[in-house]
Amino acid sequence: EVEKTACPSGKKAREIDESLIFYKKWELEACVDAALLATQMDRVNAIPFTYEQLDVLKHKLDELYPQGYPESVIQHLGYLFLKMSPEDIRKWNVTSLETLKALLEVNKGHEMSPQVATLIDRFVKGRGQLDKDTLDTLTAFYPGYLCSLSPEELSSVPPSSIWAVRPQDLDTCDPRQLDVLYPKARLAFQNMNGSEYFVKIQSFLGGAPTEDLKALSQQNVSMDLATFMKLRTDAVLPLTVAEVQKLLGPHVEGLKAEERHRPVRDWILRQRQDDLDTLGLGLQGGIPNGYLVLDLSMQEALS
């Protein structure tokens, strides 16, 4: 808190300009009118204030707008945004994407702060859904943004927004998140031809079911091992050796290096050894020849 003191003679601020950087904190408090500050917020970011001085200016705005700042002020906060608490931000109603971009710019190159997380939450809730322009903006500033959302939050992403997603945006997504995103991506890219479709859908395949993987295996897609290793184990297990060979194409040789890791390890255990031998990779651990394989899950479903 800055104590209330009278403004010294001749120091009353008539406009927000660079002369104010030479004011002591108490002088800023006493000599800068909050309404003047609010109308000239666009000048503040260009003036080399210290954060201590910005704290004083924030205090003045807080007194002027106890219920939360109007968007006309928020849009021009600049580095003053760094002095806001999540509690401050929860009082705001931010509707303009330009305002969001301006504030994200201040935090650019740094991890998402609690302030930014609150701002994004307020913005998205205000919009009702995560539209393409918003998603474009958020993933540009925070590539991991999408994977920070819960499956429930991701369900509000319209399929049209999926076009904004880049492969690196999905790097930290877990299977539950990909389960939600994959059907949206499938819908979004459904009108593309085979090879183009695969390029777009590839990063989402961690959420693909068995039948879609079987369909892909018929399209000469040559899936790389890194993508294969991210597939759902339960989706890979029912694939035959022939289907996996078609799915991976020339990359099938990479299975040997991954034979001890999921999902390859679990898939090997489900295949007949003589089928595995046809690959010529020396994969071991399949079902020995002559053994009868009972699929108990099918038996339970029938009874």
């Epitope: 080399p48 204030f49 210290t50 954060y51 580095y79 760094l82």
Partner: nanobody, 116 residues
Framework: QVQLVESGGGVVQPGGSLRLSCATS????????MGWFRQAPGKGLELVAR???????MYADSVKGRFTISRDNSKNTVYLQMNSLKPEDTAVYYC??????????WGQGTQVTVSS
């Protein structure tokens, strides 16, 4: 975190000169360049002079024409040349800057006393 170390303070007679130095322990990433501040006994901290990232200099009215701020990037050092010193310039002088994350940084200060 980059350290700021001021030096060059001392006792000087009115009308005399001093040159303060502020050495940084590494490259600083400052939002508002580097400033020289001072705090007289019982008074608030005030900015005396600032040199922005683009080299622009700014001075408080009370020191204009007497003090000069400059920097030597190769030595990671900022200077304050103080001429025609007056008793009212007596204070602890600090260098400081603001980063891009919401924090102000200050050195430990150097005492300047102007007295006959």
């Amino acid at each position: 975190q980059v350290q700021l170390v001021e030096s060059g303070g001392g006792v000087v007679q009115p009308g005399g000169s001093l040159r303060l130095s502020c050495a940084t322990s590494g490259t600083i990433f400052s939002r508002n360049g580097m400033g020289w501040f001072r705090q007289a006994p019982g008074k608030g901290l005030e900015l005396v002079a600032r040199i922005l990232n683009d080299g622009t200099t700014m001075y408080a009215d009370s020191v204009k024409g007497r003090f000069t701020i400059s920097r030597d990037n190769s030595k990671n050092t900022v200077y304050l040349q103080m001429n025609s010193l007056k008793p009212e310039d007596t204070a602890v002088y600090y260098c400081g800057y603001s980063d891009y994350r919401g924090t102000d940084y200050w050195g430990q200060g150097t005492q300047v006393t102007v007295s006959s």
